[in-house]
């Protein structure tokens, strides 16, 4: 499956929106930094099949969508930017869904990518627990936003690699 150029642009637009969402000085949040244990190995194109990597991207975007569509998230961010962010994520989910089903049969997807999907889910579980522990403070949200931007950047770079391999 050749991920469309629009998907890459959508990813870039999502990153720009995430960058624009910042509300407070990042410098005041340094002591809130946290190691969420981003599952980098799941997105390693050399180690995993293309379908698995795409499936992991799909799960990451789905989990990001879930995270930013909570009541607490709505209270933390600008509504207009958040709505635009949802649209970009939704479009990417559609692109990836089409891609995954094209790579392998629907039945095989769940079994084949169970470990990578679980790793991504656990990663987002740690993010959610961190936010709860920090009582959804502005700095906690800034740290999470920075983390999501980093993981998005990482997956964007890998998607470029996947497109080149086609």
């Amino acid at each position: 499956c050749d991920l469309p150029q629009t998907h890459s642009l959508g990813n870039r637009r999502a990153l720009i929106l995430l960058a624009q969402m910042g509300r407070i000085s990042h410098f005041s949040c340094l002591k809130d930094r946290y190691d969420f244990g981003f599952p980098q190995e799941v997105f390693d194109g050399n180690q995993f099949q293309k379908a698995q990597a795409i499936s992991a991207f799909h799960e990451m975007i789905q989990q990001t969508f879930n995270l930013f569509s909570t009541k607490d998230s709505s209270a933390a961010w600008d509504e207009t930017l958040l709505d635009k962010f949802y649209i970009e994520l939704f479009q990417q989910l559609n692109d990836l869904e089409a891609c995954v089903t094209q790579e392998v049969g629907v039945e095989e997807i769940a079994l084949m990518n169970e470990d990578s999907i679980l790793a991504v889910r656990k990663y987002f579980q740690r993010i959610t627990l961190y936010l709860m522990g920090k009582k959804y403070s502005p700095c906690a949200w800034e740290v999470v936003r920075a983390e999501i931007m980093r993981s998005f950047s990482f997956s964007t770079n890998l998607q470029k690699g996947l497109r080149r391999k086609d």
Epitope: A19, F27, K31, R33, R145, E147
Partner: antibody, heavy 121, light 107 residues
């Protein structure tokens, strides 16, 4: 390949102004902060200040507040350190380094090669 | 500002020796501590971040430990290329501050 390339050595007279640069490449420039560090001849490292190129938010060490200005031009992936009036005591090697901001990643993992500033009458 | 104090300021050791450098913060910095190596005429190089995480490409003979106010950098078996100056730096709050450095010389 990630690189921070600094401008060349400068020889200036006391009272002159100066602006040195640090150009980032091989990574998303706005996703990392840029810090500046001074090292006077034969001395240790002194942290001067930091800038977030995404919005130009800047913080200085109290020792350097009002003595230098840190700025950035994200359109050309370049950070700057400038003096409006140099003193002989500004003679030092100046380094820039990138910082991952609030994301969990190694701090100051890439450094520029350094810019030697000599201020002498 | 958070003060960082390194000890010793210099030490002499032989190739193969186990070397330990300590760093103390004037207040708790959790595990937000970095260690750098600097050779004459060169830019500093990150060795350890977050007190104990080894930076990619750094030999495993380097290790870091500690949390709160007391930290240690250990070189398990000193190699000829390890003779340099080592700095600790706190990264929990601005301004980030460095220790005064520890120079490791050949005995």
């Amino acid at each position: 390949e990630v690189q921070l390339v600094q401008s060349g050595a400068e020889v200036k007279k006391p009272g002159e102004s100066l602006k040195i640069s640090c150009k980032g490449s091989g990574y998303s420039f706005t996703s990392y902060w840029i810090g500046w560090v001074r090292q006077m001849p034969g001395k240790g490292l002194e942290w001067m200040g930091i800038i977030d190129p995404s919005d130009s938010d800047t913080r200085y060490s109290p020792s350097f507040q009002g003595q230098v200005t840190i700025s950035a031009d994200k359109s050309i992936s370049t950070a700057y350190l400038q003096w409006s009036s140099l003193k002989a005591s500004d003679t030092a090697m100046y380094y820039c380094a990138r910082h991952p901001g609030l994301a969990w990643a190694p701090d100051f993992d890439y450094w520029g090669q350094g810019t030697l500033v000599t201020v002498s009458s | 500002d958070i003060q960082m104090t390194q000890s010793p300021s210099s030490l002499s050791a032989s190739v193969g020796d186990r070397v330990t450098i300590t760093c103390r913060a004037s207040q708790s910095i959790n595990r937000f501590l970095n260690w750098y190596q600097q050779k004459p005429g060169k830019a500093p190089k990150l060795l350890i971040y977050a007190a104990s995480s080894l930076q990619s490409g750094v030999p495993s003979r380097f290790s870091g430990s500690g949390s709160g106010t007391d930290f240690t950098l250990t070189i398990s078996s000193l190699q000829p290329e390890d003779f340099a100056t080592y700095y600790c730096q706190q990264a929990i709050d601005l301004p980030f501050t460095f220790g005064q450095g520890t120079k490791v010389e050949i005995k």
